[in-house]
Amino acid sequence: GSSPRSGVLLRGCPTHCHCEPDGRMLLRVDCSDLGLSELPSNLSVFTSYLDLSMNNISQLLPNPLPSLR
């Protein structure tokens, strides 16, 4: 379900990634250098920036991030 409107609830942050707010709604997600072989599965729809550098992701399927706006 959708999360309630709140200023005290944290947006979803994928395990082991580093996240920080980007304004009132959005989230910057840094998943660099984590040895990932695929995209993190629980990305917030409010992700404004995603860093996947220095991982082991060899290919992306078409439309790999359908949940993102």
Epitope: L10, D22, R24, M25
Partner: antibody, heavy 117, light 107 residues
Framework: QVQLVQSGAEVKKPGASVKVSCKAS????????MQWVRQAPGQGLEWIGE????????NYNQKFQGRVTLTVDTSTSTAYMELSSLRSEDTAVYYC??????????WGQGTTVTVSS | DIQMTQSPSSLSASVGDRVTITCRAS??????LNWYQQKPGKAVKLLIS???RLHSGVPSRFSGSGSGTDYTLTISSLQPEDFATYYC?????????FGGGTKLEIK
């Protein structure tokens, strides 16, 4: 710099109401939520509720629902917390604090409310 | 409501020590955890958000880790100004709830 300046200590009788103010400066008041948290003597922190000053949308801890009212005056960048039907266990330090996307980054100095007959 | 259990409730340590404080949630909070520091007579201070993100101005000797229900705050080398009370807080669901606190005292 960001500052949250709260009103002074209050002593109230059981059954009365108290209204604590929190004047914000150093940032755009309507861009951040205001949280209210209390701390009873020797105890931990307890969330009371929050208000979005941009449109006065509120969330309350069910424990306080019906007894607490959060309001803002955007013309003076001031937030208010009113707690009614006071009882002795409401004796605590009450804090206002601003938040953005899930974390509280600046806190007021606290207002001591003592409920005693 | 999600219950947050912090341990230990108090801890004696010396300057230079490595200290770990743990926080356990009653259910998975998906890394949505903050850590705060409180000193007597001072405003509460944010140390870490999103489990591991150091707030601006917080020394790098502080670090946060964990996942699921179990999280830790580590101070790699205690400094005199670190003696205080520390609280964890979950930001996964309303109402946000705090741990009972860990009072860090000088040995």
């Amino acid at each position: 710099q960001v500052q949250l300046v709260q009103s002074g200590a209050e002593v109230k009788k059981p059954g009365a109401s108290v209204k604590v103010s929190c004047k914000a400066s150093g940032y755009t008041f309507t861009n951040y939520w205001m949280q209210w948290v209390r701390q009873a003597p020797g105890q931990g922190l307890e969330w009371i509720g929050e208000i979005d000053p941009s449109d006065s949308y509120t969330n309350y801890n069910q424990k306080f629902q019906g007894r607490v009212t959060l309001t803002v005056d955007t013309s003076t960048s001031t937030a208010y917390m009113e707690l009614s039907s006071l009882r002795s266990e409401d004796t605590a330090v009450y804090y206002c604090a601003r938040s953005l996307s899930g974390y509280v980054d600046y806190w007021g100095q606290g207002t001591t409310v003592t409920v005693s007959s | 409501d999600i219950q947050m259990t912090q341990s230990p409730s108090s801890l004696s340590a010396s300057v230079g020590d490595r200290v770990t404080i743990t926080c356990r949630a009653s259910q998975d909070i998906s890394n949505r955890l903050n850590w705060y520091q409180q000193k007597p007579g001072k405003a509460v201070k944010l140390l870490i958000s999103y489990r591991s993100r150091l707030h601006s101005g917080v020394p790098s000797r502080f670090s946060g880790s964990g996942s699921g229900t179990d999280y830790t705050l580590t101070i790699s080398s205690l400094q005199p100004e670190d003696f205080a009370t520390y609280y964890c807080q979950q930001g996964n669901s309303l109402p946000p709830t705090f741990g009972g606190g860990t009072k860090l005292e000088i040995k």
